[in-house]
Each structure stands twice: as structure tokens, then as C-alpha cells.
């Protein structure tokens, strides 16, 4: 259970969750493992089961406190091991010393919704959720608008280097269906990462006025 | 770009001590684990010791265990090994290596090694 190509990754949601994916080609499914994490300049330690989410990777949540609470800061290093049950013993698989600040990815944005629909133009805003005030301003976002017949895949990036949490989304056809996503990422850190796409947002332009274009 | 400078090598006696040290570059230094490792003349490359980013985790090859210390300082950018009762048979060439990441994985210790030094040698010989 312990010869094949592993890997462990964790990430820091600014607030309250370490999120970790521990992988192993040729691990046995019913491996029992956990994620111990052992802060350097905290009280508490803290450990979560790894439950399976594929053939050969498994997950799990460090919740270090209430979801809006700012459980740590960039100056925190919370070591982070893997252990798995071998017999009656348990062997360390993977170990970091984890810097926070320098493995983010935030929650989906949230709150979704319709500002303002015409014929040719949609604005749309959202909410960052979860998100440390350490942040203030330094926020990046990606949007993309799924158009009919094409695929989220298909869909052009539109980036916003500021925190801008609205867009106005122009040159779209007149009573058309889309749906819109937006994800958001810090600009500190040097394993951050986009945070997860939100749920898509669906809206419809309004009808071009009759004997109009 | 990455550069890790080995140095402190030199000849010894059997039971006598040295300190290696590496000077890293081109990278954020405490955001990675680091190890050493060696080569032996007409021997393959064998991993000797690896630390964690912050030096909150030590590891040791049995080979050396109880006579070696690998430590770091992130202010410096430096890592070292401190080799004591040194032994014929720890006569190599000894690289300091970067992973390529913050994690270390104890069961495959040479796993994930992305960048070496040019390496420092240490003769033990009376």
C-alpha cells in the first residue's frame, strides 16, 4: 500500500479550513489515514479522517474554528503529517511544515445575482465568502459566460486584476439563454490557487424591440 | 534561477566531525524542504537526510542515524550537516538538494528532488 507515486496537497480558505488531498497510485481503497496538523505558535492540534473521493485519492477538512473566524495568520506554520494505519501501528506517509498565506484558495464566490438585464448587456454581481479582511484589496477574479451551443471549456477568460465584484457582461444576443461563473484568487502566496468555480448563474437577455435589430 | 553552493568538505580522520553547509538562491528558501545526499566512488546516488521547510521535521537514513544533524537557517538561506564519528564508508561526494515542493515523503525520501549543488567532497581516511 505504500510503493506507488503519492502526493499531498493543502490549502488555507483565509479563515477556518485546511483543506487536504492526499493521493497514492496503488493504495488499497480501504487504507485507513489521517491529517494531523501542529501549529507552532497555537494551542490546539488538530486531526481529520481521509475519506475517499476516487479510485486513489482522498480528502478531508481541518475545521480549526466558525467559518468567519480568523484562526490564522502569515506568520503561522502548522506542521501537516499524513499517517496511515499499517497492522496495529501508524507510519508517517507525508509531512509539511505549511505556511497558510502561501497555499490559498478561497471559497466559491457566492451570491450571485442579476443587477441589471437589456437586450445586449447583463450586469452581474456576487459576494466573496469567507474571505480574511487581511486580503483588504489584493484580489483577483476570472469570469466566463457559457453561450448556447458551446461548453464552459469553450468560454473566454475575462480577468479582473482588482476586487471588482460586478461585471457588465456586453455584445450578448438578444433573448438568449446563458449562464455566468466566477472564481476569485489572492495575489499572495506561492502555491495559491482560483478558488472553485461558483454555481453558474443563469439569465436570459431581453427580446430585441420590435422592428429592431 | 535555482543555485545551491555546497561547502565545509574536506579530509578527516575516522571518528572526527565536519560541518557542511549550503548556500540556496533563486528560490523562497523556507517555503521548501531541502535534503542532502551522496555519492559514493562507482556507487549510485543515496539520500542521507531531509528537513522540513520551517525544520519542525528531521529525517535520517539509518546509515547515519545518531551521527548526523541536518539543521536550516531560513534567515540565511542556508542548510547544513553536521557530521560527526564519521566512518570510511561515509567518503562520498555530498549534494544539498531542493524538493519540489514543501512535502517530504518518509517512505520514498528521494521523491521529488527537482535541484541539486554541485556538491562538496568528504574523504575520511587516516
Known amino acids: 500500500a505504500v510503493n506507488g507515486t503519492s502526493r499531498f496537497t493543502c490549502f488555507y480558505n483565509s479563515r477556518a479550513n485546511i483543506s487536504c488531498v492526499w493521493s497514492q497510485d496503488g493504495a488499497l481503497q480501504d487504507t485507513s489515514c489521517q491529517v494531523h496538523a501542529w501549529p507552532d505558535r497555537r494551542r490546539w492540534n488538530q486531526t481529520c479522517e481521509l475519506l475517499p473521493v476516487s479510485q486513489a485519492s482522498w480528502a478531508c477538512n481541518l475545521i480549526l474554528g466558525t467559518p468567519d473566524s480568523q484562526k490564522l495568520t502569515a506568520v503561522d506554520i502548522v506542521t501537516l503529517r499524513v499517517m496511515c494505519r499499517e497492522g496495529v501501528r501508524w507510519r508517517m506517509m507525508a509531512i509539511q511544515d505549511f505556511k497558510p498565506f502561501e497555499n490559498l484558495r478561497l471559497m466559491a464566490p457566492i451570491s450571485l445575482q442579476v443587477v441589471h438585464v437589456e437586450t445586449h448587456r447583463c450586469n452581474i454581481s456576487w459576494k466573496i465568502s469567507q474571505a480574511s479582511h487581511y486580503f483588504e484589496r489584493h484580489l483577483e477574479f476570472e469570469a466566463r459566460t457559457l453561450s448556447p451551443g458551446h461548453t464552459w471549456e469553450e468560454a473566454p477568460l475575462m480577468t479582473l486584476k482588482q476586487k471588482q465584484e460586478w461585471i457588465c457582461l456586453e455584445t450578448l444576443t438578444p433573448d438568449t439563454q446563458y449562464e455566468f461563473q466566477v472564481r476569485v484568487k489572492p495575489l499572495q502566496g506561492e502555491f495559491t490557487t482560483w478558488s472553485p468555480w461558483s454555481q453558474p448563474l443563469a439569465f436570459r437577455t431581453k427580446p430585441a424591440a420590435l422592428g429592431k435589430d | 534561477q535555482v543555485q545551491l553552493v555546497e561547502s565545509g568538505g574536506g579530509l578527516v580522520q575516522p571518528g572526527g566531525s565536519l560541518r557542511l553547509s549550503c548556500a540556496a538562491s533563486?528560490?523562497?528558501?523556507?517555503?521548501?524542504?531541502m535534503s542532502w545526499v551522496r555519492q559514493a566512488p562507482g556507487k549510485g546516488l543515496e539520500w542521507v537526510s531531509s528537513i522540513t521547510g520551517a525544520g519542525r521535521g528531521t529525517y535520517y537514513a539509518e546509515s547515519v542515524k545518531g551521527r548526523f544533524t541536518i539543521s536550516r537557517d531560513n534567515d540565511k538561506n542556508t542548510l547544513y550537516l553536521q557530521m560527526n564519528s564519521l566512518k570510511p564508508e561515509d567518503t562520498a561526494v555530498y549534494y544539498c538538494?531542493?524538493?519540489?515542493?514543501?512535502?517530504?515523503?518518509?517512505?520514498?525520501?528521494?521523491?521529488?528532488?527537482?535541484?541539486r549543488g554541485q556538491g562538496t567532497r568528504v574523504t575520511v581516511s587516516s
Open positions: 533563486g528560490f523562497t528558501f523556507s517555503n521548501y524542504a
Open positions: 538538494a531542493k524538493y519540489d515542493s514543501s512535502t517530504f515523503y518518509p517512505p520514498t525520501p528521494a521523491r521529488g528532488i527537482a535541484d
